[in-house]
Amino acid sequence: SGPLPKPSLQALPSSLVPLEKPVTLRCQGPPGVDLYRLEKLSSSRYQDQAVLFIPAMKRSLAGRYRCSYQNGSLWSLPSDQLELVATGVFAKPSLSAQPGPAVSSGGDVTLQCQTRYGFDQFALYKEGDPAPYKNPERWYRASFPIITVTAAHSGTYRCYSFSSRDPYLWSAPSDPLELVVT
């Protein structure tokens, strides 16, 4: 028999955590697990419990986490890595829509995230979506073209900026931009 199936690792309420705000990491394996091991990668830091509660997010807690579990003498495969991001480390970028935030169905729009700092990475979030669109750019701005807009593209967007040198320390979110599809 091979290794046990991997557990899931999630951050609640989100893996994007404003500085000083709480977050809980939870490792979930099958019922009746003997032992969990949760670790922060590249840190030599571990615990034997399934739940890690962080009462106040700090810069040094940002990074990659994973977990596994043991039943008898067998260890599971490791969970997928969880990227825990500290937000609010830097000032917020600005988010704009070109040619504008109201667009006709079937038309094109470009969301542009811009920062005063020399960041080379940008992330665009749509409220309700689980994952961001990431776009590495060099010149302090990133463009996110949306071609052939549909009603599904309407909603609230925010962007973040950060540096590839510190990929888990992000800016505060931009002010929200409401994209309206008519």
């Epitope: 949760l38 670790e39 922060k40 840190s43 030599s44 830091r45 571990y46 615990q47 034997d48 419990q49 890690l52 509660f53 962080i54 106040a56 700090k58 040094s60 807690l61």
Partner: nanobody, 127 residues
Amino acid sequence: QVQLQESGGGLVQPGGSLRLSCAASGRTFTRSIMGWFHQAPGKEREFLAGISWSGANTYYADSVRGRFTISRDNAKNTVSLQMNSLNPEDTAVYYCAADPSHPGSLISTRRSDYDSWGRGTQVTVSS
């Protein structure tokens, strides 16, 4: 810094038990991750067990998991290591250490993360 003093070491027969205690003084104790290490003659100092500032999170080296139990009492500024099923390979000097700077509760197995150390207590397992 935290000042630390271990006690409870001694001579014990194989299969026996021993409880080590570490008394701490200093205002940062309740914010510190605490760890126990041991050092056998001619060997490196090794991590054995650690406990978070709240006591909710623990971590054990594979060699002692299931035999040793770490606990702490923040009201009394003490951390303890209950050692059961001792064998001759456990013979070493046992050290208590504090990691006061880490803001989380994950326990480091790395010596360099602990900046306060006791002087150690000798544990000898022999018949």
